[in-house]
């Protein structure tokens, strides 16, 4: 689609005569008829296939044509066409004399033609005007012409339709050849695809407008390159969405079970050595002079009963001092000045002479000890019970009363409350210091996962790549309906 434009510039008819040679009376009131048709080697009769146009009377005899005075107030004359411009044409321009105001052919006198020119040739589409002048024996016509494309048409033949737009169907302007030129931020054949934020992850991110980065389910971050871990994941990370890969020292489905209590909490005091012994359990080995589960209690040096033979111990700043009973001496009252004759053995101990009576030794009955059998045996002094167990003397032996969650002779074994599988419906059991905790699967709740609840399995957006998620109400699981080009239970794998 385009327009052939003809600009009439000057018409000369000095003698004011008609084509027949007869003069016009009083002068030749001149108007023009224009016929544009397809190329003919010899311009022939027949339809003006490319269009026709007439002007009003433009002047008398000889005159210049103003830029706006022809064709109903238009110069250049417009001959629009709605086909592909063929590049060739035939043009016929007739000058007629109109004695009156009626310019219809049938209203003109029989001899009204002044002159007629016919040209044919090639003409390319373009902005430049071609200037031409045609002379006959009596007249001269100067004019110029060109072919330009109509609005929204482009190319050598005005055959390419291109309408700039900036809407849902495209974001572009048109190049001179009719090709699309995308507006900044858009791409694709019709400039419909936005160019996402630079660096936006190709698979995990998308955008609906330029410089945007919207994350697909399971991804986050400015560039959608960070996966979202499983909901509730405490001390874990992910490499794909909904994972919960535990950090070192943590365990369990949500990485919330402390496997390295010693490092995370440093429970042992006063320089004691900490040993991990299972989830949230540990043992402190105290330095000398300290006691307690966490070695938090400072031992008095007298607590170890260093004074023998009934000597009494007194704490001092730089240690302790033994006050020996009569007949004993030494740092710990270990030396005796007594003999068996003095009946030094208590609690039924039997006395034996030594070193020709210069010394003696007591043989103590069960449950008694000391140089003179003066001490009742306390089998708990070495604090043999682990994990805060309480040591009890039971006659000739001792026993440990363990805290909840521990067992064994010395409370050294952690009792798994989970051993009897207390969590229903596939719940995951977690041992705690004081009991256990159940993590319930989707669709169940309660302390032991015994309560069934209706769930939306799709709530966590488990499907990737814009797949549609459906909840299977019979099993409370999800099903992903993959878009074209993706497979997998979560549509996570591209085809091929």
């Amino acid at each position: 689609s385009g327009v052939f434009q003809l600009q009439l510039q000057e018409f000369i008819n000095e003698r004011g005569v008609l084509a027949s040679g007869r003069p016009c009376e009083p002068g030749c009131r001149t108007f023009f008829r224009v016929c544009l048709k397809h190329f003919q080697a010899v311009v022939s009769p027949g339809p003006c296939t490319f269009g026709t146009v007439s002007t009003p009377v433009l002047g008398t005899n000889s005159f210049a044509v103003r830029d706006d005075s022809s064709g109903g107030g238009r110069n250049p004359l417009q001959l629009p066409f709605n086909f592909t411009w063929p590049g060739t044409f035939s043009l016929i321009i007739e000058a007629w004399h109109a004695p009156g105001d009626d310019l219809r052919p049938e209203a003109l006198p029989p001899d009204a033609l002044i002159s007629k020119i016919a040209i044919q040739g090639s003409l390319a589409v373009g902005q430049n005007w071609l200037l031409d002048e045609q002379t006959s024996t009596l007249t001269r016509l100067r004019y110029s012409y060109r072919v330009i494309c109509s609005d929204n048409y482009y190319g050598d033949n005005c055959s390419r339709l291109c309408k700039k737009r900036n809407d849902h169907f495209g974001h572009y302007v048109c190049q001179p050849d009719g090709n699309l030129s995308c507006l900044p931020g858009w791409t694709g054949e019709y400039c419909q695809q936005p160019i996402c934020l630079s660096g936006c992850h190709e698979q995990n991110g998308y955008c609906s407008k330029p410089a945007e980065c919207l994350c697909r389910p399971g991804w986050q971050g400015r560039l959608c390159n960070e996966c979202i871990p499983h909901n509730g994941c405490r001390h874990g990370t992910c490499s794909t969405p909904w994972q919960c890969t535990c950090d070192e020292g943590w365990g369990g489905l949500f990485c919330d079970q402390d496997l390295n209590y010693c490092t995370h909490h440093s429970p042992c005091k006063n320089g004691a050595t900490c040993s991990n012994s299972g989830q949230r359990s540990y043992t402190c080995t105290c330095r000398p002079g300290y006691t307690g589960v966490d070695c938090e209690l400072e031992l008095s040096e007298c607590d170890s009963n260093p004074c023998r033979n009934g000597g009494s111990c007194k704490d001092q700043e730089d240690g302790y001092h033994c006050l020996c009973p009569p007949g004993y001496y030494g740092l710990h009252c270990e030396h005796s000045t007594l003999s068996c004759a003095d009946s030094p053995c208590f609690n039924g101990g039997s006395c034996r002479e030594r070193n020709q009576g210069a010394n003696y030794a007591c043989e103590c009955p069960p449950n008694f000890t000391g140089s003179n059998c003066e001490k009742k045996v306390d089998r708990c002094t070495s604090n043999p019970c682990a994990n805060g167990g309480q040591c009890l003397n039971r006659g000739p032996s001792r026993m440990c009363r363990c805290r909840p969650g521990f067992t064994g002779t010395y409370c050294e074994l952690h009792v798994s409350d989970c051993a009897r599988n207390p969590c229903a419906h596939g719940g995951t059991c977690h041992d705690l210091e004081n009991g256990l905790m159940c993590t319930c699967p989707a669709g169940f709740s309660g302390r032991r996962c015994e309560v069934r609840t209706s769930i939306d399995a799709c709530a966590s957006s488990p499907c990737f790549n814009r797949a549609t998620c459906y909840t299977d109400l019979s099993t409370d699981t999800f099903v992903c309906n993959c878009p074209y080009g993706f497979v997998g239970s979560r549509c996570e794998f591209p085809v091929g």
């Epitope: 016929c35 397809h38 311009v43 027949g46 003006c48 296939t49 026709t52 033609l113 016919a118």
Partner: antibody, heavy 119, light 111 residues
Framework: QVQLVQSGAEVKKPGASVKISCKAS????????IHWVKQAPGQGLEWIGY????????NYNQKFKGRVTFTTDTSTSTAYMELRSLRSDDTAVYYC????????????WGQGTLVTVSS | DIVLTQSPASLAVSLGQRATISCRAS??????????MKWFQQKPGQPPKLLIY???NQGSGVPARFSGSGSGTDFSLNIHPMEEDDTAMYFC?????????FGGGTKLEIK
């Protein structure tokens, strides 16, 4: 009103020539074309060709080329057709008709001229 | 040359009825959206008279009961209602290519 008046009937011997005239009136002669059409007795119509009355440009049917010539006299608004080397199958009515660039077609016709070729 | 084939060769139609004459060209006579096809009426002893030009446009002074249609290679002339004065020969003619050619004609009569 527009009129095309042709010359009268002709009887010619084979090998001779004939020149038929067509005088126009009631319109601007030089703006138009004149066509010539043949109609043999009881037959259809056959186009011979045309001439531009403005510049004398012609277009002939190949079948008649070399034997036919069109001319015009703008001073008398008359068109002529000369047919040479006449044969018996040239016996026919010959019509002139006007035509224009702004296609209406051959809208006005002469009354026809009968040419008889007989030995 | 473009050959124009008219059918039927002759046709008898009752007064007031419709007459349809067909004309088929050996190749398309269309160019740039215009059909270079004309229809003529000829009565005995008279020159042809232009009825239709450019396939469907009526010539000057032609009654409205004459109409033309078609494009490309297939064209038709319709006369409705048929009148006594319409008895004549009818010719189609193409002007797309030199030599201009006419159809063989259709003789229309009153039934």
């Amino acid at each position: 009103q527009v009129q095309l008046v042709q010359s009268g009937a002709e009887v010619k011997k084979p090998g001779a020539s004939v020149k038929i005239s067509c005088k126009a009136s009631g319109y601007s002669f030089t703006a138009y074309y004149i066509h010539w059409v043949k109609q043999a007795p009881g037959q259809g119509l056959e186009w011979i060709g045309y001439i531009s009355c403005y510049n004398g440009a012609t277009n002939y049917n190949q079948k008649f080329k070399g034997r036919v010539t069109f001319t015009t006299d703008t001073s008398t608004s008359t068109a002529y057709m000369e047919l040479r080397s006449l044969r018996s199958d040239d016996t026919a009515v010959y019509y002139c008709a006007r035509d224009y660039d702004y296609d209406v077609g051959m809208d006005y016709w002469g009354q026809g001229t009968l040419v008889t070729v007989s030995s | 040359d473009i050959v124009l084939t008219q059918s039927p060769a002759s046709l008898a139609v009752s007064l007031g009825q419709r007459a349809t004459i067909s004309c088929r060209a050996s190749e398309s006579v269309d160019n740039y959206g215009i059909s270079f096809m004309k229809w003529f009426q000829q009565k005995p002893g008279q020159p042809p008279k232009l009825l239709i030009y450019a396939a469907s446009n009526q010539g000057s002074g032609v009654p409205a009961r004459f109409s033309g249609s078609g494009s490309g290679t297939d064209f038709s002339l319709n006369i409705h209602p048929m009148e006594e004065d319409d008895t004549a020969m009818y010719f189609c003619q193409q002007s797309k290519e030199v030599p201009w050619t006419f159809g063989g004609g259709t003789k229309l009569e009153i039934k």
